[in-house]
């Protein structure tokens, strides 16, 4: 089963000159020599207005969806990775119940 997450759309204030993009981002491995990056003036919203959006996780901008989402650290979940899983408290709970 797959948990489909919320995505948040950054505000639309792009200019016409910023309207094309040839290389989205995912892999940082070799082979990317900067070719086709002449139109890469657009700012990644994760580095701007969404810089502190993910509380316990990494902000990711998904170009296809024009939206940001959060890759949560272990134990955290929710739209902004702000909620902690209760699973980690099971040992404490069991000791309190004695």
């Amino acid at each position: 089963s797959v948990r489909v997450e919320q995505v948040v759309k950054p505000p639309q204030n792009k200019t016409e000159s910023e309207n094309t993009s040839d290389k989205p981002k995912r892999k940082k491995k070799g082979g990317k020599n900067g070719k086709n990056r002449r139109n890469r003036k657009k700012k990644n919203p994760c580095n701007a207005e969404f810089q502190n959006f993910c509380i316990h996780g990494e902000c990711k901008y998904i170009e296809h969806l024009e939206a940001v989402t959060c890759k949560c650290q272990q134990e955290y979940f929710g739209e902004r990775c702000g909620e902690k899983s209760m699973k980690t408290h099971s040992m404490i709970d069991s000791s309190l119940s004695k």
Partner: antibody
């Protein structure tokens, strides 16, 4: 029911132009990236262009870059492909396709989940 | 650019046979343990149809005799027991966020 219907294909001379349209229905159009994929007669599938949900990001292979322009009108649930400086090798059936996707754990998995029936573009003198 | 190579280019099989088609990418299409590879079926004169996404997930409505596996650069599409309607051409496609979004050259599955 998801439906994608292409139109605008036809016979055009080398160097000419053509504009393809794709009318979408049965889903929230502005929530999906869209693409054009073509298939030359008797050949395999070739990706032609992709546009993001709001049109801010467009992508092309080198074979069509500078000649083809993808666009969308979310108010009209329509996708377009403007093809200029057409060549004989652009002869193909052109399909519009929706990018289905899963988003989980910060990962974005996408695939072409719905396709139109295709429209034939023939470039010949 | 990532090149996708399918093998075989064509094969003949009989109804009831188990069939395997392979797809090899010129570089990994994995990212943090996720495989960005899809499989499509196309019949003559028809649009392609999605069978498998993310290497191993069966698309809704696709019969369970179809399955996908693999990771990194090597992937397989398996049809466990071939049915008459399965004779078609099959394509793999990489769906990383790095264009071009390339397809394999196709594998034509014919009746023996």
């Amino acid at each position: 029911e998801v439906q994608l219907v292409e139109s605008g294909g036809g016979l055009v001379k080398p160097g000419g132009s053509l504009r393809l349209s794709c009318a979408a229905s049965g889903f929230t159009f502005n929530s999906y990236a869209m693409s054009w994929v073509r298939q030359a007669p008797g050949k395999g599938l070739e990706w032609v262009s992709t546009i993001s949900t709001g049109g801010s990001h467009t992508y092309y292979p080198d074979s069509v870059k500078g000649r083809f322009t993808i666009s969308r009108d979310n108010a009209k649930n329509s996708l377009y492909l403007q093809m200029n400086s057409l060549r004989a090798e652009d002869t193909a059936v052109y399909y519009c396709a929706r990018h289905g996707y899963l988003l989980y754990d910060g990962y974005y998995e996408w695939y072409f989940d719905y396709w139109g029936q295709g429209t034939l573009v023939t470039v010949s003198s | 650019d990532i090149q996708m190579t399918q093998s075989p280019s064509s094969l003949s099989a009989s109804v009831g046979d188990r069939v395997t088609i392979t797809c090899r990418a010129s570089q990994s299409v994995d990212y943090d343990g996720h495989s960005f590879l899809n499989w499509y079926q196309q019949k003559p004169g028809k649009a392609p149809k999605l069978l498998i996404y993310a290497a191993s997930n069966l698309q809704s409505g696709v019969p369970s005799r179809f399955s996908g596996s693999g990771s990194g650069t090597d992937f397989t599409l398996t049809i466990s027991s071939l049915q008459p309607e399965d004779f078609a051409t099959y394509y793999c496609q990489q769906s990383t966020e790095d264009p071009p979004y390339t397809f394999g050259q196709g594998t034509k599955l014919e009746i023996k």
